[in-house]
């Protein structure tokens, strides 16, 4: 079940996606694609970052926040009804089955006579719950210490995982502290 975001025709749409680099410059590759997240990568890529820069983008799709601080939220400029649908934000942490993928649903409404601002940056009201957990596997899995120590803060599409009693093990797979708001 995707978290739904709304925008009006002619306005800019905002799809949130965040992670917190362990240290400045310790960036993780990220891709955005139109359509639900496939098994790997992003389908129909509209924007991509690597460990240093935004290295691929298409017109109307851009990162308004500071991606070097982990704000990889996507802005779609001057949306039309055709922009409706599922978008995939994939935080591509290196390692086997180690990425974080999030499907966000964008709903475009016809323009009102008096358009109102649609960007909502205060997510506290929408996502009041905070879960912080640290995965600890057996000693053998401490190889994970060799992986980037990344805090991932995701503000979308995690309702299902909150219901998963085995969430802690999923977090162990990423070797990261994850905060879900």
């Amino acid at each position: 079940s995707e978290v739904e975001y709304r925008a009006e025709v002619g306005q800019n749409a905002y799809l949130p996606c965040f992670y917190t680099p362990a240290a400045p410059g310790n960036l993780v590759p990220v891709c955005w694609g139109k359509g639900a997240c496939p098994v790997f990568e992003c389908g129909n890529v509209v924007l991509r970052t690597d460990e240093r820069d935004v290295n691929y983008w298409t017109s109307r799709y851009w990162l308004n926040g500071d991606f070097r601080k982990g704000d990889v939220s996507l802005t779609i400029e001057n949306v039309t009804l055709a922009d409706s649908g599922i978008y995939c934000c994939r935080i591509q942490i290196p390692g086997i089955m180690n990425d974080e993928k999030f499907n966000l649903k964008l709903v475009i409404k016809p323009a009102k006579v008096t358009p109102a601002p649609t960007r909502q940056r205060d997510f506290t009201a929408a996502f009041p719950r905070m879960l912080t957990t640290r995965g600890h596997g057996p000693a053998e899995t401490q190889t994970l210490g060799s992986l980037p120590d990344i805090n991932l803060t995701q503000i979308s599409t995690l309702a299902n995982e909150l219901r998963d009693s085995r969430l802690a093990n999923d977090l162990r797979d990423s070797g990261a502290t994850i905060r879900i708001g």
């Epitope: 790997f40 990568e41 086997i96 089955m97 085995r166 999923d170």
Partner: antibody
Framework: QVQLQQSGGGLVHPGGSLRLSCAAS????????MTWVRQAPGKGLEWVSG????????YYADSVKGRFTISRDNSKNTLYLQMNSLRDEDTAVYYC???????????WGQGTLVTVSS | EIVMTQSPDSLAVSLGERATINCKSS????????????LAWYQQKPGQPPKLLIY???TRESGVPDRFSGSGSGTDFTLTISSLQAEDVAVYYC?????????FGQGTRLEIK
């Protein structure tokens, strides 16, 4: 001592199904990510599928997506690969393997041969 | 996907001599944030499953003889056997685990000259 004991291989007609099993001892399968790798006769290694430590995420190679299903039974400490709509090109020795963290494969099963032929 | 290409396809080396196998990835498997190369080497003998030799491109798995060593970074990697022994006859594979799908090289068959 970590061991992975495989079973379930055999001869099957194209379009048929098989379920491979990988019984683990020396560790619990719900603690580690696990994977299946196959090797066609005389060929190299091809990654097939994987499952995360919790079982919450599953991954498949394009060549098997929609036909194969990876799963596990924690109570039996066993990993499975359900293979449907089998094709001639699925003929291979299938190996299960344990993944260290999110990196390399440190323990492998002995392999089980799947032959798809009419 | 990342394509792994090994060279040579086969190699014949005299006992006690050095054997070198190369592996090239189609894109870098070095993660700059932790300076780790997400690459492993496996040995497979006939009728047996693969055996892990090297991970992180240069870290030897416990129990692996020290005549085996791995080197390289980014896209170019090498497995070296410093003094070939009879029991080293096998097929050797490199594998990247930087990003999915996990991919292996096509293998290098090592024989005794």
């Amino acid at each position: 001592q970590v061991q992975l004991q495989q079973s379930g291989g055999g001869l099957v007609h194209p379009g048929g199904s098989l379920r491979l099993s990988c019984a683990a001892s020396g560790f619990t399968v719900d603690t580690y990510a696990m994977t299946w790798v196959r090797q066609a006769p005389g060929k190299g290694l091809e990654w097939v599928s994987g499952i995360s430590g919790s079982g919450g995420s599953t991954y498949y190679a394009d060549s098997v997506k929609g036909r194969f299903t990876i799963s596990r039974d924690n109570s039996k400490n066993t990993l499975y690969l359900q293979m449907n709509s089998l094709r001639d090109e699925d003929t291979a020795v299938y190996y299960c393997a344990k993944i260290v963290g999110v990196t390399h494969f440190d323990y492998w099963g002995q392999g089980t041969l799947v032959t798809v032929s009419s | 996907e990342i394509v792994m290409t090994q060279s040579p396809d086969s190699l014949a080396v005299s006992l006690g001599e050095r054997a070198t196998i190369n592996c090239k990835s189609s894109q870098s498997v070095l993660y700059r944030s932790n300076n780790k190369n997400y690459l492993a080497w496996y040995q497979q003998k006939p009728g047996q499953p693969p055996k892990l030799l090297i991970y992180w491109a240069s870290t030897r798995e416990s129990g692996v003889p020290d005549r085996f060593s791995g080197s390289g970074s980014g896209t170019d990697f090498t497995l070296t056997i410093s003094s070939l022994q009879a029991e080293d006859v096998a097929v050797y594979y490199c594998q990247q685990y930087y990003s999915g799908p996990i991919t292996f090289g096509q293998g290098t068959r090592l024989e005794i000259k």
